[in-house]
Interface confidence: low
Amino acid sequence: QPSVSPGEPSPPSIHPGKSDLIVRVGDEIRLLCTDPGFVKWTFEILDETNENKQNEWITEKAEATNTGKYTCTNKHGLSNSIYVFVRDPAKLFLVDRSLYGKEDNDTLVRCPLTDPEVTNYSLKGCQGKPLPKDLRFIPDPKAGIMIKSVKRAYHRLCLHCSVDQEGKSVLSEKFILKVRPAFKAVPVVSVSKASYLLREGEEFTVTCTIKDVSSSVYSTWKRENSQTKLQEKYNSWHHGDFNYERQATLTISSARVNDSGVFMCYANNTFGSANVTTTLEVVDKGFINIFPMINTTVFVNDGENVDLIVEYEAFPKPEHQQWIYMNRTFTDKWEDYPKSENESNIRYVSELHLTRLKGTEGGTYTFLVSNSDVNAAIAFNVYVN
């Protein structure tokens, strides 16, 4: 028992005065705590705790589940403990089968013994399978068996605690190790489209894909320079054990001009963070802007060729394009094509090819274009010398 200087509060005294006690199943456990300021006994095993306000703890018929640490505490908060093993040949292990290990950390297989005098307390693979060669463990009869530095490869490993009793190997119930992967890289994030152009009242919907080793990756859509919480919906999949994918879809059902801005999909884990942005532009109505690629006043010599070229921006997409001269529409000699094959493209090119012009073919050539919201036109004045 501990000794202290006179005048200082001392820890309680426990009888029997030993750190460990072994009793047989069915026998009596009788523990006496002596202290003028006795407060309580506490019993702990695995995640269970039990309290007793009597200074004598009596269990008339001990069972294997009475194995554990009995602690007496006094009013000064000082305590003393005794560990009791209840030897039961039919129940050598107490078991908490939940077994989770964080990658690169140690984890405890919780199978404390009821008899500390059995031998060869260790781990064994299920169905006689060997354990991974690099798996290291440290047995502790009072706590269980500590697996050192859990590897990702141990995920779903089936194992038993094992002891030798009278020359025979006895196995506990089986444990399945679930490994929580450590984050060793930032999440991978991507967005369905880098920019969106919409008219007022149209729906804005954008999807961010987040990939990581586990579902505990955090992700959110944020509006740049705004704290407003955005409404998002999630879909997620586990493609195998350490390949997790989440799709976070942000929707604004009826976009307004002031919804325009940059939206960021942000994801982070314990390793770091990553983000990707998309730009939304909302216009009150559609538009067409025409840019001549040559001067709108053109001088050519008789018999020469000239190409009249315009670029134009149209949103929504152009529906009707035509070149007109003297109230007549050209059916050929011109072509119209998108400037890029990108699905976000709003820029187009139109070219009218005039060949071997005669003096009588001078005048005003007009390009007309329309979409569902607006019409636009540009005129070229051609002089043939």
Partner: nanobody, 129 residues
Framework: QVHLVESGGGLVQAGGSLGLSCAAS????????MGWFRQAPGKEREFVAA????????LYADSVKGRFTISRDNGENTVYLQMNSLKPEDTAVYYC??????????????????????WGQGTLVTVSS
């Protein structure tokens, strides 16, 4: 995906009270036990209190028993920690945590840190003497 956000921390005089809240999103909150832990500077993170999925079972660290009360509102996806008779030694960052390893619908609560898979970022409680 689980996201836990604590709030309610701050500076309080010894003997005063403070209420912490933890809002959970992204999980069927009502299926799981929840816990509060705390970490004082330079010390290990320690268990404070836990509550079962239904609120029927609670567990407290000896150091807070009788002073702190844990409760939950499954409709609001929120767990609370009411702290009364605060002492300077209660100064710490308080974390809320979700135990997704427990069996759905059991009254199980645990003080063991390793059982809790999801953690909030923490809220600082300072008790001045």
């Amino acid at each position: 995906q689980v996201h836990l956000v604590e709030s309610g921390g701050g500076l309080v005089q010894a003997g005063g009270s403070l209420g912490l809240s933890c809002a959970a999103s992204g999980h069927t909150f009502s299926n799981y036990a929840m816990g509060w832990f705390r970490q004082a500077p330079g010390k290990e993170r320690e268990f404070v209190a836990a509550i079962s999925w239904s609120g029927g079972s609670t567990l407290y660290a000896d150091s807070v028993k009788g002073r702190f009360t844990i409760s939950r509102d499954n409709g609001e996806n929120t767990v609370y920690l009411q702290m009364n008779s605060l002492k300077p030694e209660d100064t710490a960052v308080y974390y809320c945590a979700l135990d997704s390893t427990g069996v759905y619908g059991t009254g199980y609560v645990s003080s063991r840190k390793g059982r809790y898979e999801y953690w909030g970022q923490g809220t600082l409680v300072t008790v001045s003497s």
